[in-house]
């Protein structure tokens, strides 16, 4: 997260880290005791999932292996549409005040809505500085019409933009797949943006979760 702040401890109990060994690979969000939602471009053969801590690599955090993941069947490595994936944990999480599932959206929030994005991604760009603490950034949803002024046809129908006018605050390497939460519901998953990260008036681009609720519910049901 560029130009963000340290999240209030315990305020993001649904935030998970997808680790490759001990190294941060992507962010993710707990949606059920067996399931984590993340970006399709974060696909790996297997995952080590850290839950219940704001510190990356925290020895006291829950760590659960995941060997199955389900990309959206329409994910395109060319256009990056449908950049969403469900990861099934090999064992259920132990829910607590530190580990909770996020609320999936009932509706799509409108432009102008205040949201928070979080992650352990680099805080500097292009040179990287990975924080140990979970970082947050407060951003607002931007209309597709406004966002298309920047990204033109790169912006798909199920992509969502967020940012703050004239501000550098944005997501970056390592934040991928992490949650954009608006009014206590999951509205976005970090997908992409311009580089170096934090160029003012280049919004962050997210997968718009409200458009995938049915796919999420059906996939979890199918692979119970």
């Amino acid at each position: 997260i560029i130009d963000g702040y340290k999240c209030k401890e315990g305020s993001h109990p649904w935030q998970v880290a997808l680790l490759k060994g001990n190294q941060l690979h992507c962010g993710g969000v707990l949606v059920d005791k067996y399931w984590v939602l993340t970006a399709a471009h974060c696909k790996m053969g297997q995952y080590q999932v850290q839950l219940g801590s704001d510190k990356i690599g925290d020895q006291s955090a829950q760590k659960i292996k995941a060997t199955k993941s389900f990309r959206h069947p329409g994910y395109s490595t060319k256009t990056h549409v449908n950049d969403i994936m469900l990861v099934r944990l090999d064992e259920p999480v132990k829910m607590s005040s530190k580990v909770e599932a996020v609320q999936l959206p009932e509706h799509c929030e409108p432009p102008g809505t205040s949201c928070t994005v979080s992650g352990w991604g680099t805080t500097t760009s292009p040179d990287v500085t990975f924080p140990s603490d979970l970082m947050c950034s407060d951003v607002k949803l931007i209309s597709s019409r406004e966002c298309k002024k920047v990204y033109k046809d790169l912006l798909g129908k199920t992509m969502l933009c967020a940012g703050i006018p004239d501000s550098k605050t944005n997501t970056c390497n390592g934040d991928s797949g992490g949650p954009l939460v608006c009014n206590d519901t999951l509205q976005g998953l970090v997908s992409w943006g311009t580089y170096p990260c934090g160029q003012p008036n280049d919004p962050g681009v997210y997968t718009q979760v409200c458009k995938y609720k049915r796919w999420v519910m059906e996939t979890m049901k199918t692979h119970r």
Partner: antibody, heavy 122, light 108 residues
Framework: QVQLVQSGAEVKKPGSSVKVSCKAS????????ISWVRQAPGQGLEWMGW????????NYAQKLQGRVTMTTDTSTSTAYMELRSLRSDDTAVYYC???????????????WGQGTMVTVSS | DIQMTQSPSSLSASVGDRVTITCRAS??????LNWYQQKPGKAPKLLIY???SLQSGVPSRFSGSGSGTDFTLTISSLQPEDFATYYC??????????FGGGTKVEIK
């Protein structure tokens, strides 16, 4: 300071295969894509394809589809490009390049290997 | 696929000259255009990304402009070390990445 270090020059017979390596020394490329670009003698640059070090997803140039395979070994921060059924017009310098970006998109090549000369001759 | 056309394919100039190279895309690529410099026997080197942003460590005599389909690389005062071949590429509709044919800058 990260550098991309490629394997040495190769001389190959038509119909054979070549595998070129590209190692990130002094760092990793786990947040990037690695692209392969070739340049025939006296010619311009030709993009061959790339592999996401995030996911292993690949995209290949249409004209090379079926003959090229790109892989990475993240434990050694090494990328590989294998080209099969070599022909004389595959004679070129092969470069690996780091595609800078974050998340699903990559925008430009900010770091290049030194190049590997592959000569295909009977 | 988007085609990139560079002009001229070669030019002769003297040290101190202002040099302009153009790159035209077959369709709009917004500002997603990059410029590279390549010297004989060496790998290309990134000069400009996003049409006008100077890569770290690149001298300020290099500048880029344009958006949509027409782009320009300008060297404000040519130095001896600038004699090289220059390539553009587009990163808008990718893959594939498409490069221009190159412009060779030679000593007059």
């Amino acid at each position: 300071q990260v550098q991309l270090v490629q394997s040495g020059a190769e001389v190959k017979k038509p119909g054979s295969s070549v595998k070129v390596s590209c190692k990130a020394s002094g760092g990793t490329f786990s947040n990037y894509a690695i692209s392969w670009v070739r340049q025939a003698p006296g010619q311009g640059l030709e993009w061959m394809g790339w592999i996401s070090a995030y996911s292993g997803d690949t995209n290949y140039a249409q004209k090379l589809q079926g003959r090229v395979t790109m892989t990475t070994d993240t434990s050694t921060s090494t990328a590989y490009m294998e080209l099969r059924s070599l022909r004389s017009d595959d004679t070129a310098v092969y470069y690996c390049a780091r595609a800078a970006g974050y998340g699903a998109r990559h925008w430009y090549f900010d770091l290049w290997g030194q190049g590997t000369m592959v000569t295909v001759s009977s | 696929d988007i085609q990139m056309t560079q002009s001229p394919s070669s030019l002769s100039a003297s040290v101190g000259d202002r040099v302009t190279i153009t790159c035209r895309a077959s369709q709009s690529i917004s500002s997603y255009l990059n410029w590279y410099q390549q010297k004989p026997g060496k790998a290309p080197k990134l000069l400009i990304y996003g049409a006008s942003s100077l890569q770290s460590g690149v001298p300020s005599r290099f500048s880029g402009s344009g958006s949509g389909t027409d782009f320009t690389l300008t060297i404000s005062s040519l130095q001896p070390e600038d004699f090289a071949t220059y390539y553009c590429d587009q990163s808008y509709s990718t893959p594939p990445i498409t490069f221009g044919g190159g412009t060779k800058v030679e000593i007059k």
